[in-house]
Interface confidence: low
């Protein structure tokens, strides 16, 4: 008799993939066009990244530290109207991409939560989600928790009002905390939340660091869906040197729990590379001539329309990745193992019962490494076979789909290695 | 009127790190970006690196590991530090400011610093 | 980086002549979306910094006299003093903005006969 199939998980949709931020509706669009219906313009362009959701703005109307200027219900007119925004839904529920709106209330001031006055903001917020939720989002993001005064209370009554009005619907918080119990006494108090954090950017890029921050993580919150990411807003470029961008997106999109980008980190986007260009919010390069102040500093490698040409860049790696994170059951919602695998190397297992496998092997170092696989570290429920088929590298070269010896697994420096094998009764 | 001077000492040893100071007039920091360019004695001039309006920095790859440049808006300073100084960092150090036309920044300098001698030597 | 070459590196001319001297880039400085060349001319005095006289390759500074012209394209510029004064004597450096970092000409120094 065929073992028993073991029982799906509840799956939400934030759970199916990657999310995508878009802070900085000008930046993302360029050439002063940055508003709702030209971001309606470009969701084909999310669609073809597979992502599952678009966290957008704030866009409201946010008169800098003036409370009493800041209204959670208006639309800035700098980026459209009410009108836009609904445009903005059909159009994006039609293509399956969900929208959470960004309700940091004081966005453009010095404190994202106004330095006073924090019962009348918490009611403005309150106010916001009842509001927006009857319009048709899917969910929210409050920015910069950690300037908010009792966030804990405050998260657990928004997260009340936006479960009460259906299980569908998101709340994500973004802290530019790294310190773990921090992040734990803020997800202990709330259930179900989406926590965004600086968590991850001081990996110092290394194998054995990042597979203990990745560890100590998941060990901490149990059987929570977690979000990856390596702040609650800014690029991976922030944080990455360019060699271990492909690396970080490997890891990101393989990891148990929701994925989530900022525009540009799909192509590597660098404000160091564009002069005069906020490190926050830099322009995104669509061509070469989405930055005409300095000619010649974008050249068409950098941008989505020269890597969308090219089957090797970073683009077409998160595409990829993006659509097995949405496909297999094991990215989905499988079961996590990491172990041993020599000096300067992350290594795990994502399984769900008799799916097919996955194994991850990153080369955090920048020096090739032979890989000493410690299958002892392992449950039986996860063993590993003598041989696993490359379904990608990070790397150019490696010739896809043939099958490698584990035992001989030799990997380039900063190079990602995603294998996988079928289910051995 | 715009006005920019460089201030700093005017030796240093072998090793050591150099300070210069760039005090602005007449021009905010919060909009205009300002480089430093060096020129050995009598030798022609090398673009250093620039501190833009937003408070981002490049510098020139051959400098790139010993170079910081930074600024306080409050007291219109920019400040160039390089570490590691040799007998070949001996130069006239000039700030100047990197013209800015409203939207754009492009890599001319129309303000330059009346700049400062800096000689290494033990 | 984009290496910039003068020529000559110096030049002894008498007050009222015509002078011209070249400058020349590793890749072109043309940038097609605008037309423009991303190059800039500028006079140093013996003791002094640096002035700028060019920018746009032949676009000259407020206050320039207009005896200095710029001209050329692409990879090929020349700065031309239509008629020498003795205060023109000086070390002139063409420099490219096109590409990072911004480099410099060696320069052509201008001399008295």
């Known amino acids: 008799r065929a073992p028993r199939c073991r029982e799906l998980p509840a799956q939400k949709w934030w759970h199916t993939g990657a999310l995508y931020r878009i802070g900085d509706l000008q930046a993302f669009q360029g050439h002063g066009a940055g508003n709702l219906a030209g971001l309606k313009g470009r969701l084909d362009y999310l669609s073809s990244l597979k992502v599952k959701g678009l966290v957008l703005g704030p866009i409201h109307k946010n008169q800098k530290d003036d409370v009493a200027q800041t209204d959670l219900l208006q639309i800035d007119p700098n980026f459209g109207s009410k009108e836009d925004f609904d445009s903005l839904l059909q159009s994006a529920k039609k293509k399956s991409i969900r929208v959470i709106l960004d309700l940091t209330p004081n966005y453009r001031g010095e404190n994202s939560w106004f330095s006073t006055q924090v019962d009348t903001v918490a009611t403005k917020v309150k106010d916001a989600l009842e509001f927006w939720l009857q319009a048709g989002v899917d969910g929210f993001q409050v920015r910069d928790i950690e300037n908010l005064k009792d966030a804990s209370s405050f998260l657990a009554e928004w997260q009340n009002i936006t479960k009460g009005f259906s299980e569908d619907r998101l709340l994500i918080a973004g802290t530019n905390s790294s310190d773990l119990q921090q992040i734990l006494s803020l997800l202990e108090s709330n259930k179900d939340l989406l926590l965004t954090s600086s968590y991850l950017s001081d990996s110092g890029s290394t194998g054995e660091h990042t597979k203990s921050l990745v560890t100590q993580y998941l060990n901490a919150t149990g059987n929570r869906w977690c979000s990856w990411s390596l702040s609650q807003a800014r690029l991976l470029t922030s944080f990455l040197p360019a060699q271990l961008l492909r690396l970080y997106q490997l890891m990101l999109f393989t990891l148990p729990g929701t994925p989530v980008f900022s525009y540009g980190d799909e192509i590597g986007l660098d404000a160091a590379a564009l002069p005069g260009q906020p490190m926050e919010a830099p322009v995104m390069l669509w061509d070469e001539s989405s930055f005409p102040d300095i000619p010649g500093a974008v050249s068409a490698n950098m941008t989505v329309k020269g890597q969308s040409e090219d089957p090797g860049s970073l683009l077409s790696l998160f595409r990829r990745l993006s659509d097995q994170r949405s496909k297999e059951r094991s990215l989905l919602h499988g079961d996590f193992h990491a172990f041993s695998a020599g000096p300067g190397l992350f290594s795990y297992i994502r399984h769900w019962d008799q799916n097919e496998r996955f194994l991850v092997v990153l080369n955090f170092g920048d020096v090739g490494l032979s890989a000493g696989l410690q299958a002892s570290d392992l449950p039986a429920s996860a063993s590993l076979p003598a041989k696993a088929d490359l379904l990608l590298s990070t790397q150019p070269g490696r010739e896809e789909g043939s099958p490698l010896e584990l035992e001989r697994l030799k990997l380039e420096p900063h190079e990602g290695l995603l294998l996988r094998f079928p289910y051995a009764a | 009127q715009v006005q920019l001077k460089e201030s700093g000492p005017g030796l240093v040893q072998p090793s050591q790190t150099l300070s210069l100071t760039c005090t602005v007039s007449?021009?905010?920091?919060?909009?205009?970006?300002v480089i430093w360019v060096r020129q050995p004695p009598g030798k022609g001039l090398e673009w250093m690196g620039v501190i833009w309006a937003n408070g981002n920095t490049n510098y020139n790859s051959t400098l790139k590991s010993r170079l910081s440049i930074s600024r306080d808006t409050s007291k219109s300073q920019v400040y160039l530090k390089m570490n590691s100084l040799q007998t070949e960092d001996t130069a006239t150090y000039y700030c100047a400011r990197h013209y800015y036309d409203g939207t754009y920044y492009y890599g001319y300098f129309d303000y330059w610093g009346q700049g400062v001698m800096v000689t290494v030597s033990s | 980086d984009i290496v910039m070459t003068q020529t000559p590196s110096s030049q002894a001319v008498s007050a009222g002549e015509k002078v011209t001297m070249n400058c020349k880039s590793s890749q072109s400085l043309l940038y097609s979306e605008n037309k423009k060349n991303y190059l800039a001319w500028y006079q140093q005095k013996p003791g002094q910094s640096p002035k700028l006289l060019i920018y746009w390759a032949s676009t000259r500074e407020s206050g320039v006299p207009d005896r200095f012209i710029g001209s050329g394209s692409g990879t090929d510029f020349t700065l031309t003093i239509s008629s020498v004064q003795a205060e023109d004597l000086a070390v002139y450096y063409c420099?490219?903005?096109?590409?990072?970092?911004?480099?410099f000409g060696p320069g052509t120094k201008l001399e008295l006969k």
């Open positions: 007449g021009f905010s920091l919060s909009t205009y970006g």
């Open positions: 420099q490219q903005y096109y590409y990072f970092p911004y480099t």
